[in-house]
């Protein structure tokens, strides 16, 4: 059978007897910044070009005695995971290696920066197809390393990095904390977070997704036909770099934002046991395990959205938290969440010519998170319509009045310290879906968008008795763009999107009592794009042989057939 | 020995090219900041990445590096420019005493300075 990790990332319909396209990733070049590598290993021979770049710290001034095979161990294994003949993810990808880690696997921020600069200069001198840069390393939070990653990403390069093996918040490490980088945590064969002793995979809002990272069999630098098992978030990141190479080879024009959204979309959802993560990190950590798409055809019509959490605001009364979307994503809605329930809502506001989501802490609150729903919506024209707090007891309401604009999200923000002491609003009359309704003490913000073929609908799920969690999901073919709660009273901790489900969290029922005040409604706004679907159908009609699907169908490879002769 | 000669040579060049005196003060109202790794054992004091403002050209980066060397030399400090960045970020990598940070933060075009630190295979 194929190794567990390759089986795990293979789409279900191919698991029975097929594995990988023989030339998957062939249009893509993957740069590996790591230790030296054994480039004549059978797994990677002819696939990896060792550049002349080397910038590593000395091993503390004494000669390093571990033989070359250990110096090459980490990098060789990762090169094999990305593109190895037998045990690689993207068997057709070509790689270039830069040595930025010494024989102990140690490097410097400055050496990594110079390596990234080297890649940028190489790209300028000789532009090739899509580039993926794999950074299977981590250091403490570094503003400069994150900035360099941002610049390289904005130059069209896809950067994939290890979340880190410190069983800690990935946001405390770099390049894991750089928003433009795809940050990967590690899971094992049971889809559980990888543990080793007191350490293990990092987690938190800076992780984009998880991938196999425990007991991964790959090229060993012991000898040119040796294999060995290694574990870590580096191995997980190598899987995602391989998947990215496959996707980019099938669709070379994909932008970083499109690639990230696809990686998230095709991941296995909700399979990780969240109990492993610290309680305060569970809601922030994506429950996603990377997988290859079953086909790239049919993906284009989808309206892709992801949830972006802000950093924690901190506890001061006027503290705010800001969540931002990537440059080519649209902010379609904004919500907020506070563990203490003390918050003053959220609003969408313009910052540097782009909409951001800002959440407001309240007096006595422990702090808030802003949660942005970031979507890929080509040719979109979005604006925010605001209604100030209403005088009438009916509550505040605002709708999308411009022709052709549809409602994609509702936010509410209030100045009063505790909405719970004020009468809640009457719920929205039926038949008026294109408007946001909120507490009369709150200002309401509607996100209104015009995009070709965009249609949206509101879906509500109300529970009369108090409950800690109320959810409502969009059905197949529709994508969740907005998630909010009605009413905005103080026992509601906030609302956030998890994949295609809107989650509204309330304070523990034992503290709220079971009065009508406890009633909570989760409001989801579900959208789809007929334009994208149409464009995709046209593309399918006129294209053949370029999708992953076609490559998969083209040649079936059983892993062990190619592997057994090494034994 | 080679290294010392290299340092001396660089220093002489920097002093010679320093025609415009001590300081072009940084742009009004902006203060450059200093950053270092929060994890103490991973810090590498003595090596610093000086990051310049976004639109700084390579020639300005080189001039700023030379200016730092000249000003440091006047105070009796040796510095070594290890790398001048361009292409991704404008700036330079410098080996110098931490005593010079205050001086370096006041140089023109400086956005922030970060002390070098370790990264590790994961």
């Amino acid at each position: 059978s194929i190794p567990w990790n390759l089986e795990r990332i293979t789409p279900p319909r191919y698991r029975a007897d097929e594995y990988q396209p023989p030339d998957g990733g062939s249009l893509v070049e993957v740069y590996l910044l790591d230790t030296s590598i054994q480039s004549d290993h059978r797994e990677i021979e002819g696939r990896v070009m060792v550049t002349d770049f080397e910038n590593v710290p000395e091993e503390d001034g004494t000669r390093f005695h571990r033989q070359a095979s250990k110096c090459d161990s980490h990098g060789t294994h990762l090169a094999g995971v990305v593109s190895g003949r037998d045990a690689g993810v993207a068997k057709g990808a070509s790689m270039r290696s830069l040595r930025v880690l010494n024989c102990q696997g140690k490097g410097t921020v400055s050496g990594t920066l110079i390596g990234l600069e080297f890649i940028r200069k190489s790209q300028l001198v000789q532009p090739v197809g899509p580039l993926v840069v794999l950074l299977p390393l981590a250091g403490g939070y570094s503003r400069v390393l994150n900035a360099a990653c941002q610049r390289l990403a904005r130059a069209g390069v896809v950067l994939v990095t290890a979340a880190g093996n410190f069983r800690d918040d990935a946001c405390l490490y770099s390049p894991a904390s750089a928003p433009e980088v795809i940050t990967v945590g590690a899971t094992n064969a049971q889809d559980q977070p990888v543990t080793l002793g007191t350490l293990g995979t990092n987690f938190g809002r800076c992780v984009d997704l998880f991938a196999p990272g425990e007991d991964i069999i790959g090229a060993s630098s012991d000898c040119s036909t040796c294999f060995v098992s290694q574990s870590g978030t580096s191995q997980a990141a190598a899987h995602v770099a391989g998947i990215a190479a496959m996707m980019l080879s099938a669709e070379p024009e994909l932008t970083l934002a499109e690639l990230r959204q696809r990686l998230i979309h095709f991941s296995a959802k909700d399979v990780i046991n969240e109990a492993w993560f610290p309680e305060d990190q569970r809601v922030l950590t994506p429950n996603l395990v990377a997988a290859l798409p079953p086909s790239t055809h049919g993906a284009g019509w989808q309206l892709f959205c992801r949830t972006v959490w802000s950093a924690h605001s901190g506890p001061t009364r006027m503290a705010t938290a800001v969540a931002r979307c990537a440059p080519d994503e649209e902010l379609l809605s904004c919500s907020s969440f506070s563990r203490s329930g003390k918050r003053r809502g959220e609003r969408m506001e313009a910052q540097g010519g782009k909409l951001v989501c800002r959440a407001h802490n309240a007096f006595g609150g422990e702090g808030v998170y802003a949660i942005a729903r970031c979507c890929l919506l080509p040719q979109a024209n979005c604006s925010v319509h605001t209604a100030p707090p209403a005088e009438a007891s009916m509550g505040t309401r605002v709708h999308c009045h411009q022709q052709g604009h549809v409602l994609t999200g509702c936010s509410s923000h209030w100045e009063v310290e505790d909405l719970g002491t004020h009468k809640p609003p009457v719920l929205r009359p039926r038949g008026q879906p294109n408007q946001c309704v909120g507490h009369r003490e709150a200002s309401i913000h509607a996100s209104c968008c015009h995009a070709p073929g965009l249609e949206c609908k509101v879906k509500e799920h109300g529970i009369p008795a108090p409950q800690e969690q109320v959810t409502v999901a969009c059905e197949e073919g529709w994508t969740l763009t907005g998630c909010s709660a009605l009413p905005g009273t103080s026992h509601v901790l906030g609302a956030y999107a998890v994949d295609n489900t809107c989650v509204v969290r309330s304070r523990d029922v034992s503290t709220t009592g079971s009065t009508s005040e406890g009633a909570v409604t989760a409001v989801a706004i579900c959208c789809r794009s007929r334009h994208l679907a149409q464009a995709s159908q046209e593309l399918q009609g006129s294209t053949s042989g370029s999708g992953l699907n076609d490559i998969f169908e083209a040649q079936k490879i059983e892993w062990h057939e190619h592997h057994h002769h090494h034994h | 020995q080679e290294d010392e000669d290299g340092d001396y040579e660089e220093l002489v060049l920097a002093l010679r090219s320093e025609e415009d005196g001590l300081a072009e003060a940084p742009e009004h109202g902006t203060t450059a900041t200093f950053h270092r790794c929060a994890k103490d054992p991973w810090r590498l004091p003595g090596t610093y990445v000086v990051v310049l403002k976004e639109e700084t050209h390579l020639s300005q980066s080189e001039r700023t590096a030379r200016r730092l060397q000249a000003q440091a030399a006047r105070r009796g400090y040796l510095t070594k420019i290890l790398h001048v960045f361009h292409g991704l970020l404008p700036g330079f990598l410098v080996k110098m005493s931490g005593d010079l940070l205050e001086l370096a933060l006041k140089l023109p075009h400086v956005d922030y300075i970060e002390e070098d630190s370790s990264v590790f295979a994961q």
Epitope: P3, H65, K70, S73, C226, V228, S229 | A121, Q122
Partner: antibody, heavy 121, light 107 residues
Framework: QVQLVQSGAEVKKPGASVKVSCKAS????????IHWVRQAPGQGLEWMGY????????KFNQKFKDRVTMTRDTSISTAYMELSRLRSDDTAVYYC??????????????WGQGTTVTVSS | DIVMTQSPSSLSASVGDRVTITCKAS??????VAWYQQKPGKSPKLLIY???NRYTGVPSRFSGSGSGTDFTLTISSLQPEDFATYFC?????????FGGGTKVEIK
Amino acid sequence: QVQLVQSGAEVKKPGASVKVSCKASGYTFTGYTIHWVRQAPGQGLEWMGYINPSSTYTKFNQKFKDRVTMTRDTSISTAYMELSRLRSDDTAVYYCARERIYSNYWFFDVWGQGTTVTVSS
Amino acid sequence: DIVMTQSPSSLSASVGDRVTITCKASQNVYTAVAWYQQKPGKSPKLLIYSASNRYTGVPSRFSGSGSGTDFTLTISSLQPEDFATYFCQQLSSYPDTFGGGTKVEIK
């Protein structure tokens, strides 16, 4: 669960050879190097060498280089260590151990129960 | 070969005591050091890897520290099941070498 089970005790005469086996279970045998370590009575631990079961690659302590052979049979997930030209000071408990690689760390996480080899005339 | 000098070779202590065992490498081994516990007639058991990382399932009273040439294993509060022999091992350079061992006995 992951375990290494070694063959039983051996009594050998000086000049003879001994072959100790180490059967792995609970994990992919070819994915981890198997190291051999010995311990003379009342003494410390001494590393002898290792084999990478995915190939026939071996690395030995120079001290044993001319007398030790390490092999494996992947069909039965078993590694073997043969020591020839035995001397009385080869009397020891011989252990096999699995080496694990995590990040850039190496360590022996699983050990066999040990095989006592007595060399006596 | 790198020599790992472990001290003391034996020590007597009581339940609840704090015990410290040291290992000195003849040259820099960075953090490539592991510590093992061995009970009579049993095989060694991994406690600490990479100088300071506690292995899965090892009680928190065991901790390791050091880098370069000087390493320490500390048992913060000795328990009855901790009476055993402890070995350090360097994995920085072949051949891997072990310390001579420290026997922790009941006082």
